[in-house]
Amino acid sequence: SIPWNLERITPPRYRADEYQPPDGGSLVEVYLLDTSIQSDHREIEGRVMVTDFENVPEEDGTRFHRQASKCDSHGTHLAGVVSGRDAGVAKGASMRSLRVLNCQGKGTVSGTLIGLEFIRKSQLVQPVGPLVVLLPLAGGYSRVLNAACQRLARAGVVLVTAAGNFRDDACLYSPASAPEVITVGATNAQDQPVTLGTLGTNFGRCVDLFAPGEDIIGASSDCSTCFVSQSGTSQAAAHVAGIAAMMLSAEPELTLAELRQRLIHFSAKDVINEAWFPEDQRVLTPNLVAALPPSTHGAGWQLFCRTVWSAHSGPTRMATAIARCAPDEELLSCSSFSRSGKRRGERMEAQGGKLVCRAHNAFGGEGVYAIARCCLLPQANCSVHTAPPAEASMGTRVHCHQQGHVLTGCSSHWEVEDLGTHKPPVLRPRGQPNQCVGHREASIHASCCHAPGLECKVKEHGIPAPQEQVTVACEEGWTLTGCSALPGTSHVLGAYAVDNTCVVRSRDVSTTGSTSEEAVTAVAICCRSRHLAQASQELQ
Amino acid sequence: EAPEHGTTATFHRCAKDPWRLPGTYVVVLKEETHLSQSERTARRLQAQAARRGYLTKILHVFHGLLPGFLVKMSGDLLELALKLPHVDYIEEDSSVFAQ
């Protein structure tokens, strides 16, 4: 019988025992920064090399009894989850362990930093294939630990970390809050967020995805053939490290950005019961449970996009929030969201030679989020075209006028505190898909991109009477790049992308006394790359 | 050699008080700082601290990922350390935990 967690990460139509070959992940080295481990356990022997690195604080308490099996418990279990011969995800991955946690499972930021530096130096001395670093630990927010993770990630290393077990916003912890790190929350056999005593898995915008993290069977340090069940976001992170090893073994040239996009793309969508999360965190927390890709090859033709939420702007009148894409991702669209509905829209702007998405709070607003749609689009050349407020009754329009450029996203930004109702029809004239339309008092920004074989189309879903939520999805084979609302009136809370669906949220109708004239339309821009599809077919 | 005009080094510490480890600090230097400069800055801190009657111990000099050093010292010396050349920021050490 296959453990539930291995079954869960196996794609549908496959059996886990068939799908997880004994050499899966064999081209990849996984570094584990954790407790000491029992590396001769039958489940991991020959798969894990214990390095001579050790940097741990002394155990607390004068009466602490250092019992080897307890000292090794956490690390041994995680090594088994990553590469164990019976209960591991990537059975062929080789591992190296560094001891940064003591027998009580406690370490220091400085010890972890020195461990990360050790890995970087090892990588420079003896370059091998792809490297995955598993950090199944968490501390309070640390600028220096996040900076070290960023540097290591930029050196081509994939870092995977636990979101934390504090039933709290993962952005308050490190390395979970480092944007370059793949941060993993924990779910159980019912796809529910894991509860751990009075606490549980962390959540929020700093979590990239969830993975099995409750009742996970793995190697026990009690004896060389023992197994034990453990729970936590460490176990979840170990699953993702194993999946990453499998993916990198199949495609060793994958960049961190490509790997992250694939992890998101192949995850099970919308299976987590969001009611477990605090209400204000639900929209920010990805509803994704990690899974292995259905085939180790052949995903290259897809246009991959993900949604990146900014930190909250704060409530001051001029407060702004910025969402950024990873260095090798393209910002294809930008939207904003405010729970109070008091916002002044969003715009794409250049910052340090790269486009960012900036959202603007409004007077009396409780703050805004900027939402970036970040995509993998090789050889892309994107620019932003802006039209100032038109003041005319037909509203503001802007289109992509350069030859070969297609519209990937629309943003609107206004200086007035409250946009009036926009009574004239706002749907763009058919046959002009390359233009953005907005409120006459708003400036409109069009994201226009040129990339080989890129084609995009606009999909709209308008509801005559106001609804709290309007959605429109891109069909199979197309990827959502842009999500915006028409009109940009004050009762619209904002727009954001969830997987391949554009969601437009409006204020609760019962409290606003809105009229039917304030209809809301969700506007999705769906794109695909014929170039990537052709390249993939040629490979096959 | 003072810090560049207009750039003030900042001090950071863990927001969760029980996890703080006062007495050990990571001194992070500006991005392009070489190892020799890191070592020189660490020695300079030790010398200036000694003149004030404080003992310090350099536990590790970082290079490869971030330039900087790990120092065991009194918190009284933070103001002095923040004024050292090449210093970007200083972070008090803190605990991390198995999850």
Epitope: D40, E45, G46, V48, M49, V50, A68, S69, S224, T225 | -
Partner: antibody, heavy 115, light 107 residues
């Protein structure tokens, strides 16, 4: 290179004890335990047990019934297998092999039990 | 304990022949089956692990297949140095158990 070198042949009387050694080299000993396997003349292979260099833990085959003890000395990278109350049917070649996976074997130690 | 049964117990073949040895487990062992080669007076040598994986240094003429209870070792073109006894061993459960061996002799 990776190798296991065993002690020389032994001739013992029934009721006596024998201690066979196995010195490991060329790899990190803590990452693997040592398995012991024996082969009676003209017979097949029989797994006797496993011992850890890391923490001295053992895993014995039931058949040894408390007559066998496996130990390690990490300081010399040596594993030992002691068999007490020897009987004539303990006459065999005793092999040590690396880990449970048994990917590297010693050259074998012949133990003859005869009155 | 899991019983392992090999067949045949011995076979005669010529250089260049294709040789197949089978091994059956008394219960499912997934793919946890190893094959060893042993020459007279020598220690066994690992040929195949996890049913089909060849360790480095083992010639490609040796291949393994099967899963569950039925497994096969194939020597695609027998060479003079391949005349030896071959053992299968299950690695699924403790204790590991061996088949009784198949002796490959020169015809």
């Amino acid at each position: 290179q990776v190798q296991l070198v065993q002690s020389g042949a032994e001739v013992k009387k029934p009721g006596a004890s024998v201690k066979v050694s196995c010195k490991a080299s060329g790899y990190a000993i803590y990452n693997y335990g040592i398995s012991w396997v024996r082969q009676a003349p003209g017979q097949g292979l029989e797994w006797m047990g496993w011992v850890s260099f890391y923490n001295g833990n053992t895993n014995y085959a039931q058949k040894l019934q408390g007559r066998g003890t496996m130990t390690t000395d990490p300081s010399t990278s040596t594993a030992y297998m002691e068999l007490r109350s020897l009987r004539s049917d303990d006459t065999a070649v005793y092999y040590c092999a690396r880990g449970y996976v048994m990917d590297i074997w010693g050259q074998g130690t012949t133990v003859t039990v005869s009155s | 304990d899991i019983q392992m049964t090999q067949s045949p117990s011995s076979l005669s073949a010529s250089v260049g022949d294709r040789v197949t040895i089978t091994c059956r487990a008394s219960q499912s062992i997934n793919n946890w089956l190893d094959w060893y080669q042993q020459k007279p007076g020598k220690a066994p040598k690992l040929l195949i692990y996890a049913a089909s994986t060849r360790p480095s240094g083992v010639p490609s003429r040796f291949s393994g297949s099967g899963s569950g209870t039925d497994f096969t070792l194939t020597i695609s073109s027998l060479q003079p140095e391949d005349f030896a006894t071959y053992y299968c061993q299950q690695d699924q459960d403790i204790p590991p158990t061996f088949g009784q061996g198949t002796k490959v002799e020169i015809k």
